[in-house]
Interface confidence: medium
Amino acid sequence: QPSVSPGEVDKGFINIFPMINTTVFVNDGENVDLIVEYEAFPKPEHQQWIYMNRTFTDKWEDYPKSENESNIRYVSELHLTRLKGTEGGTYTFLVSNSDVNAAIAFNVYVNTKPEILTYDRLVNGMLQCVAAGFPEPTIDWYFCPGTEQRCSASVLPVDVQTLNSSGPPFGKLVVQSSIDSSAFKHNGTVECKAYNDVGKTSAYFNFAFKEQIHPHHHHHH
């Protein structure tokens, strides 16, 4: 048991308690409140919420848990509204008093429906679809012969890559998938369908065999 010198008894402290999980998942366009309670003695002097190295100058409040003179417990709330897919990341609460500093971080992930960034016929005859979303989208391929609207015959991709998996996982994740178009010998439509837990988006390549194969494409949500 370590001994405590007389001066250490009076030393200040700050203890922070998150009131919600420090890993937060929120859907695109929804609101979330990041809430902490903290004990501070002596009384807190500076509080701030930070995101991307910038301090919030509004959208948060800080107040004592009770009005008693002896109160040492406080609450701080950051109100995030209509979050966009680009606004995920680490949100940090910092508090200090005359003796100590303390901080707590929340990792906020914004779930977004896949968006198809590009869908192209490459010079090597491959069809390529690139989609972004969070969680990571899955890309499936389907072929519908003739003028059928429902594409049910699945086509196995030749190549699938997650393009930015090395970066921090707060933003949208980008997936690239390719199939070989030389397998298609009939008029019809190829569907590239990107989906995750939030929703799905499709893009279509139309094949019309005449003198040359020139698929043109259009996009549906």
């Epitope: 910038r54 919030f56 100058t57 509004d58 948060w60 409040e61 701080s76």
Partner: antibody, heavy 127, light 108 residues
Framework: EVQLLESGGGLVQPGGSLRLSCAAS????????MQWVRQAPGKGLEWVSY????????SYADSVKGRFTISRDNSKNTLYLQMNSLRAEDTAVYYC????????????????????WGQGTMVTVSS | DIQMTQSPVTLSLSPGDRATLSCRAS??????LAWYQHKPGQAPRLLMF???TRAIGTPDRFSGSGSGTEFTLTISSLQSEDSAVYYC??????????FGQGTKLEIS
């Protein structure tokens, strides 16, 4: 009618303290950032202090930092400026002003120019 | 901190004249610039925001222009009630605001 009304000004000795109030009416006070601005005799307007809509964030001009404290009571629709260690150069008419909802910034919320001003209250620091 | 510099310090003109007031920022404030009119014994009044947008109640003889660091307030045909001190103010940095030192407009 949207209105701001300052009170609490007066004559105070150097080193003394004063608390200004600004009563808001005609709008949802808790939705708006507020400011204090002053004008010393024969001088121009000088921004003094800012407070966020919830009261969580404050900022100050260098000339008053560490001596003045801005606060608000949204339940009473009132803005305050606690002025301590007053100096002769703090002699001025003090105005409270509302920040318009003209822009939206992710870190700052709504902000803009000062669209509503009070009539001002005179603070004189003299021995 | 951003400094705002106004010129001229004083402008003496006659009714019907055109007044041009200038404001320069020490660094870019985009379009986040306001103009205020201040008469003795009254509260300052917001005239223009967004550099060129008239506030409610501002007569259309007032117009604003500029962006970045150079701004102008123009009063096309002066009236006697336009006698006042005019201030520009940047609000590009929402928790810290800066006023110019003012231009006194005298109409004789």
């Amino acid at each position: 009618e949207v209105q701001l009304l300052e009170s609490g000004g007066g004559l105070v000795q150097p080193g003394g303290s004063l608390r200004l109030s600004c009563a808001a009416s005609g709008f949802t006070f808790s939705n708006y950032k507020m400011q204090w601005v002053r004008q010393a005799p024969g001088k121009g307007l000088e921004w003094v202090s800012y407070i966020s809509s919830s009261g969580g964030y404050t900022s100050y001009a260098d000339s008053v930092k560490g001596r003045f404290t801005i606060s608000r009571d949204n339940s009473k629709n009132t803005l305050y400026l606690q002025m301590n260690s007053l100096r002769a150069e703090d002699t001025a008419v003090y105005y409270c002003a509302r920040v318009a909802h003209q822009y939206y910034d992710f870190w700052s919320g709504y902000y803009g120019a000062f669209d509503i001003w009070g009539q001002g209250t005179m603070v004189t620091v003299s021995s | 901190d951003i400094q705002m510099t106004q010129s001229p310090v004083t402008l003496s003109l006659s009714p019907g004249d055109r007044a041009t007031l200038s404001c320069r920022a020490s660094q870019s404030v985009s379009f986040n610039l306001a103009w205020y009119q201040h008469k003795p014994g009254q509260a300052p009044r917001l005239l223009m925001f967004d550099a060129s947008t008239r506030a409610i109640g501002t007569p259309d003889r007032f117009s604003g222009s500029g962006s970045g660091t150079e701004f102008t307030l123009t009063i096309s045909s002066l009236q006697s009630e336009d006698s006042a001190v005019y201030y520009c103010q940047q609000y590009n940095y929402p928790a810290s605001y800066t006023f110019g030192q003012g231009t006194k407009l005298e109409i004789s």
